[in-house]
């Protein structure tokens, strides 16, 4: 139901949902620090623009008694319970930041009259696509699907001369929240990925995956999985792998591949890693000293959510427009704003665009090297290394089906 918003007379409040169930196991204190860092920046920005207003955040904690699994499985009701708490206390701000779990975001969006914008660090699933007042600041599954289809179809690069139309997807149900929804999107029979591929089979058991690696009767040479190198090693170990197998390891929120002293282990030679272009900014930030490279993106999304709100607030105030209107609620899309780490672009549906990077392991240097980049905003691939030192024959990616000639 409608809740009155603390969002007028020069005082603007941000409601931040601090849920026990979260897309990433990040201490809530770190997220608070990220929000507070963002607030400092926004306040300064507004003051410099001659806008003498107050911006604050209210952190809404759930009691944690009922919803305490710590992951997203029991998040559906936690989000609604928090909204109820806000409603009862009449403490709704101009904008809602959180939740991060797909289940809770979907349910909250469904069960409320959203006359305010909702900004999420997460909500990766396809069920959160195309929501008019929802903004997602971490790459959703739809963006991954579009990359994969684009890459599968590509056949005019020196290192990829075959179009692919087949794939295995490894999904065993123990994935992290981001991976769960990424793989869920690839598995869904009605998804763009499934529609564009001629053959796709989901491998659910470790043994199924392991058998495929050397199975002469396999239907595809390409296996998509999601996680880090350690996850792959646990599954694959030092098993032999057929020379034309290509493993695509989706590991978007992990900067470790770009660190200077990182050497790729031997088991990564048949692997292409899909990750996001790294940022450089959080190393000296007050809120980020305790963050691991895999967590920085989550905290950064919270911070950027605050900055996005500040950006929109500044525009509306400068134009003399009301904040508590549907126009404001629907405005958080189709724009570029200054994020902490550089410009952030949101597409027509409020989803963050980014540069995805496909890495390979150089057989010469045992280092991760950039093979190509992909701009999700324009759905375009840009080759970087035209002569990669691949493990695959002739330094070219193999066909996806063994024995099939050029297309």
């Amino acid at each position: 139901s409608q809740v009155s918003q603390n969002c007028h007379n020069g005082s603007y409040e941000i409601s931040v949902l601090m849920m026990g169930n979260s897309a990433f196991a990040e201490p809530l204190k770190n997220l608070e620090d990220a929000v507070n860092e963002g607030l400092e920046i926004v306040r300064g920005r507004l003051q410099n623009a001659g806008l003498n207003v107050t911006v604050n955040a209210t952190f809404m904690y759930s009691d944690g008694l009922i919803h305490n699994s710590g992951d997203c499985r029991s998040s559906t009701c936690e989000g609604l319970d928090l909204l109820r708490k806000i409603s009862n206390a009449q403490r709704m701000g101009c904008v809602l930041i959180g939740p991060s779990c797909t289940y809770s975001t979907f349910q909250m969006y469904l069960d409320t009259e959203l006359s305010y914008p909702m900004i999420s660090a997460g909500s990766f699933g396809l069920s959160c696509d195309y929501k008019e007042t929802l903004t997602r600041l971490m790459s959703p599954a739809r963006k991954l699907m579009y990359f994969l289809v684009n890459f599968w179809k590509t056949n005019d690069l020196p290192f990829k001369t075959y179009s692919w139309s087949t794939s295995y997807v490894y999904k065993n149900g123990t994935e992290t929240e981001d991976c769960f929804w990424y793989l869920n999107a690839l598995e869904a029979s009605v998804s763009y990925f499934s529609h564009e591929l001629g053959f796709k089979v989901v491998l659910r058991q470790d043994k199924e995956f392991q058998d495929i690696l050397m199975d002469h009767n396999r239907k595809s040479n390409v296996i998509i999985m999601c996680g880090g190198p350690e996850f792959l090693y646990k599954l694959k170990g030092d098993r032999a792998v057929a020379e034309d197998i290509v493993i695509i390891l989706v590991d978007l929120f992990n900067d470790q591949y770009f660190e200077d002293n990182v050497t790729a282990p031997d088991y990564m030679k048949n692997v292409l890693v899909l990750t996001l272009s790294p940022g450089n900014s959080l190393l000296n930030s007050s809120f980020s000293r305790n963050l691991s490279p895999t967590k920085r993106d989550f905290a950064l999304a919270y911070l950027n959510g605050i900055l996005l709100f500040g950006h929109m607030l500044k525009i509306f105030l400068e134009n003399g427009e009301n904040i508590t209107t549907p126009k404001f609620a629907h405005a958080f899309r189709n724009l570029t704003f200054e994020g902490y780490d550089g410009p952030v672009t949101l597409d027509d549906w409020g989803d963050v665009d980014s540069t995805m990077v496909l890495l390979y392991t150089s057989v010469d240097t045992k280092k991760y090297k950039v093979l190509l980049t992909y701009d999700t905003h324009v759905n375009k691939t840009y080759p970087v290394d035209m002569s990669p030192t691949f493990t695959w024959k002739n330094s070219k990616l193999p066909n996806d089906i063994t024995g099939r000639g050029p297309q």
Partner: antibody, heavy 120, light 107 residues
Framework: EVQLLESGGGLVQPGGSLRLSCAAS????????MNWVRQAPGKGLEWVSG????????YYADSVKGRFTISRDNSKNTLYLQMNSLRAEDTAVYYC?????????????WGQGTLVTVSS | EIVMTPSSATLSVSPGERATLSCRAS??????LAWYQQKPGQAPRLLIY???TRATGIPARFSGSGSGTEFTLTISSLQSEDVAVYYC?????????FGQGTKLEIK
Amino acid sequence: EVQLLESGGGLVQPGGSLRLSCAASGFTFSRYAMNWVRQAPGKGLEWVSGISGSGGSTYYADSVKGRFTISRDNSKNTLYLQMNSLRAEDTAVYYCAKDRDFWSGPFDYWGQGTLVTVSS
Amino acid sequence: EIVMTPSSATLSVSPGERATLSCRASQSVSRSLAWYQQKPGQAPRLLIYGASTRATGIPARFSGSGSGTEFTLTISSLQSEDVAVYYCQQYNNWMCSFGQGTKLEIK
């Protein structure tokens, strides 16, 4: 007390390169954008380049785009301006200026400037 | 690019009198405007930002007003130490720009 100290200026031939540095102290360096502003002899102020607090955003005046590169090292509290393909019209006093904002705002503290002379 | 144009290159005002400096933007910059004072051989000093907010340590005789495209810096009672060049600057976007400056003299 906020202090900004520029260095690296000097005489250079047309087409040459110089790297200016600005050592900052007295404030949380990574929280604020930094800028380079120049002033040709007897002329007004011209904004040259700016960089956000994190270093994630960089911007340039059209007159220097493609020739100058701004950067910062937040661990050393230092701002840099790499100037390549220098021209006679780049001759000026170059000021390092601290922003009041994380991005683009007014400049609340300025260094004393370093003179760059481009001449053969 | 937003062009900032001062109303005059030079302004002569008697001591104790009011000095009014104006600046026009080629397009709206809302209230993202600053005024600076620069004395010979010195770096510029921030006087006003956000069109009307005095920077730290700036005397109350300095005030700013305006929004959109028309801005004014007023010195209510001119002192001899106020002789300087005054610059307006818009910072509504990253490509900030300065006016050419107004030289304020004692009449």
